[in-house]
Interface confidence: low
């Protein structure tokens, strides 16, 4: 179980990582090709942006979360892979307060990137109103940034 203290600092600390850096017991049961990962990210990207824009428009004045804390890409030159297992709990946690249909579609896509042998942690939302808003914003901002980083890397690498 993951706590929710300091959401902007730790949110999605495992959001993106290198598939090659994972221990063997966490490796996906089916290895996705770069083209498949790219296709999933291209589907996730507009949904993620839309959710973020919608949320920011409702919540003017919230501080921007710190993207630099997100270990999205490794310096390793091999295929970057989004760790669906790490992201899914956060999207499940923010589900109640986000667009129902969009979140379901995001979860459906993330499920394809899940490391299937890895147990999924459960994340709870902060009880404090302001912290909750920051938590949601951090998840959406850092997820959008992560997608951009991974997409850039995939675009610059072999297809």
């Amino acid at each position: 179980m993951l706590s929710h203290a300091g959401p902007a600092r730790f949110a999605l600390f495992l959001l993106c990582c290198m598939e090659t850096l994972l221990p063997s017991h966490m490796a996906p049961t089916h290895r996705l090709q770069p083209s498949d990962v790219r296709k999933i990210i291209l589907e996730l990207r507009p949904m993620s942006k839309g959710l973020l824009q919608d949320y920011v428009s409702k919540e003017i004045g919230l501080p921007e979360s710190n993207h630099s804390s997100l270990p999205c890409l490794s310096s390793d030159s091999q295929l970057p892979h989004i760790n669906g297992s790490a992201i899914l709990p956060y999207f499940r946690a923010i589900r109640p307060l986000s667009d129902k249909n969009t979140i379901d579609k995001i979860i459906e896509q993330l499920d394809k990137l899940k490391f299937q042998r890895e147990p999924e942690a459960e994340v709870s939302m902060p009880a404090d109103n302001f912290e909750r808003k920051n938590f949601i914003l951090a998840v959406l901002q850092q997820f959008s940034a992560c997608l951009e980083h991974v997409l850039q890397s995939l675009n610059s690498g072999p297809q």
Epitope: E59, S124, R132
Partner: antibody, heavy 118, light 111 residues
Framework: DVQLVESGGDLVKPGGSLRLTCVAS????????MSWVRQAPGKGLQWVAT????????YYPDNIKGRFTISRDNAKNTLYLQMNSLKTEDTATYYC???????????WGQGTLVTVSS | EIQMTQSPSSLSASPGDRVTITCKAS??????????MHWYQQKPGKVPKLLIY???NLEAGVPSRFSGSGSGTDFTLTISSLEPEDAATYYC?????????FGQGTKLEIK
């Protein structure tokens, strides 16, 4: 199609215990929070308990806390409500409900009747 | 605990009428610009059915004559043109905080 099938409702004496079961199908059960909601005969709806999708978090109203326990078995797609120290005012139809996250209750089972009477 | 007060407790209307049911919360049930208020319909002898979630979102399969609005403490369920099959009891419910609470219900009869 989403289906929620409750069972375990019965006639029980005050102070007695009962365990309700709800078997879910037609959706990825482990992705959803689940709740129990009850309705006394001829009365309105009352929320009884909620459990998060992974089972780590449970929530109850004060009049239920300590007497009822909600639990789930994701491997069996099953939700439970263990009811102890039953009172006559617990008499109601108990509905198993799928939650959307911790929020909207979007699918309801047919309900199971619990009668607490001496 | 957030108290939910629905009005009216009952009403009778004719097919084609525009019907409005209101729900007032004892404190704000909005969060992040969204009203965490939901509306359910329960027909006699049937199970409750979700109509509107988060104040204004129409649940899939629900006729477009149903709509929801409101924020903060005041919310409204509107049926734009009443149909005979709309005879039911309607409940509002908040999920802003635990314990989740329902309104006492509004019984709608068709003349």
């Amino acid at each position: 199609d989403v289906q929620l099938v409750e069972s375990g409702g019965d006639l029980v004496k005050p102070g007695g215990s009962l365990r309700l079961t709800c078997v879910a199908s037609g959706f990825t059960y482990s992705n959803y929070g689940m709740s129990w909601v009850r309705q006394a005969p001829g009365k309105g709806l009352q929320w009884v308990a909620t459990i998060s999708y992974g089972g780590s978090y449970t929530y109850y109203p004060d009049n239920i806390k300590g007497r009822f326990t909600i639990s789930r078995d994701n491997a069996k797609n099953t939700l439970y409500l263990q009811m102890n120290s039953l009172k006559t005012e617990d008499t109601a139809t108990y509905y198993c409900v799928r939650g959307y996250g911790y929020d909207t209750m979007d699918y309801w089972g047919q309900g199971t009747l619990v009668t607490v009477s001496s | 605990e957030i108290q939910m007060t629905q009005s009216p407790s009952s009403l009778s209307a004719s097919p084609g009428d525009r019907v409005t049911i209101t729900c007032k919360a004892s404190q704000s049930v909005s969060f992040a610009g969204t009203g965490l208020m939901h509306w359910y319909q329960q027909k006699p002898g049937k199970v409750p059915k979700l109509l509107i979630y988060r104040a204004s979102n129409l649940e899939a399969g629900v006729p477009s004559r149903f709509s929801g609005s409101g924020s903060g403490t005041d919310f409204t369920l509107t049926i734009s043109s009443l149909e005979p099959e709309d005879a039911a009891t309607y409940y509002c419910q908040q999920s802003r905080e635990y314990p989740w609470t329902f309104g006492q219900g509004t019984k709608l009869e068709i003349k």
